[in-house]
């Protein structure tokens, strides 16, 4: 006996009870595949979720997040509050940064600054809760007698001449 | 099938009380972390209050000591008790579901209200 199921194109459902005759899904359900025995029920988007796309009969609904929140896994499973830059989502809520720690983002985690020294520079401008460090010329490129392409004028007071 | 059905909403004087209910069926309510979330009028949606499962607590720092959640498992039911209303409090109360367990995070399989107003206005 052939199996009249898989005749069913998407959007309609192989009907057991009616002798296998495809019926369409029911409102507010989809089938994205052919020969399907069921259909599934579309995907909400509610609360912090907004509709990006309408469920059809033959594909599910698609959501984001609403202003404020951001899409976090496969297919905008979850939505995660924002936070401002030099701030983290913690346990109580959104939290600044601890001193030595900054995040340039209004998501994800406050990150250590940079470490200068480990590469042997120093440090040009000073991080901030949003902002990283700016790492400069090593200590020995800035001291004197240190050989470089445009030598360093003299420093010198006004009204003195260099020995 | 699933609902959550708020109430308790309306308009109260500032530093004056209400107390919200969410209403819960379809579901095994005793299981799931409970939660309360706001909109104001232009304002971004902002987590109030969450209750663990346990009944352990959480509250946003500009409701923390004003508002208290609590559940009645043997009603199927959640509360918020607002206390010392300021106008700032005036958005749309929603109840949901907390499958996270992480502030300020919901997921696709999250149950949520219709919502219920609140107005602080003198």
């Known amino acids: 006996l052939q199996d009249l199921c898989s005749n069913c194109p998407a959007g309609t459902f192989c009907d057991n009870n009616r002798s296998q005759i495809c019926s369409p899904c029911p409102p507010n359900s989809f089938s994205s595949a052919g020969g399907q025995r069921t259909c599934d029920i579309c995907r909400q988007c509610k609360g912090v979720f907004k509709t990006r796309k309408e469920c059809s009969s033959t594909s599910n609904a698609e959501c984001d997040c609403i202003s404020g929140y951001h899409c976090l896994g496969a297919e905008c499973s979850m939505c995660e509050q924002d936070c401002k830059q030099g701030q983290e989502l913690t346990k109580k809520g959104c939290k600044d940064c601890c001193f030595g720690t900054f995040n340039d983002q209004k998501r994800g985690i406050c990150r250590p600054w940079t470490n200068c020294s480990l590469d042997g520079k120093s440090v040009l401008v000073n991080g901030t809760k949003e902002r990283d460090v700016v790492c400069g010329p090593s200590p020995a490129d800035l001291s004197p007698g240190a050989s470089s392409a445009t030598p360093p004028a003299p420093a010198r007071e006004p009204g003195h001449s260099p020995q | 099938q699933v609902q959550l059905v708020e109430s308790g909403g309306g308009l109260v004087q500032p530093g004056g009380s209400l107390r919200l209910s969410c209403a819960a069926s379809?579901?095994?309510?005793?299981?799931?972390?409970m939660s309360w979330a706001r909109q104001a009028p232009g304002k971004d949606f902002e987590w109030v209050s969450y209750i663990y499962s346990d009944g352990n607590t959480y509250y946003a720092d500009s409701v923390k000591g004003r508002f208290t959640i609590s559940r009645d498992n043997a009603k199927n039911t959640v509360y918020l008790q607002m206390n010392s209303l300021k106008p700032e409090d005036t958005a749309v109360y929603y109840c949901a579901t907390w499958h996270t367990l992480r502030v300020g995070v919901w997921d696709e399989y999250d149950y949520w209200g219709q919502g219920t107003q609140v107005t602080v206005s003198s």
């Open positions: 379809g579901f095994t309510f005793s299981s799931y972390a």
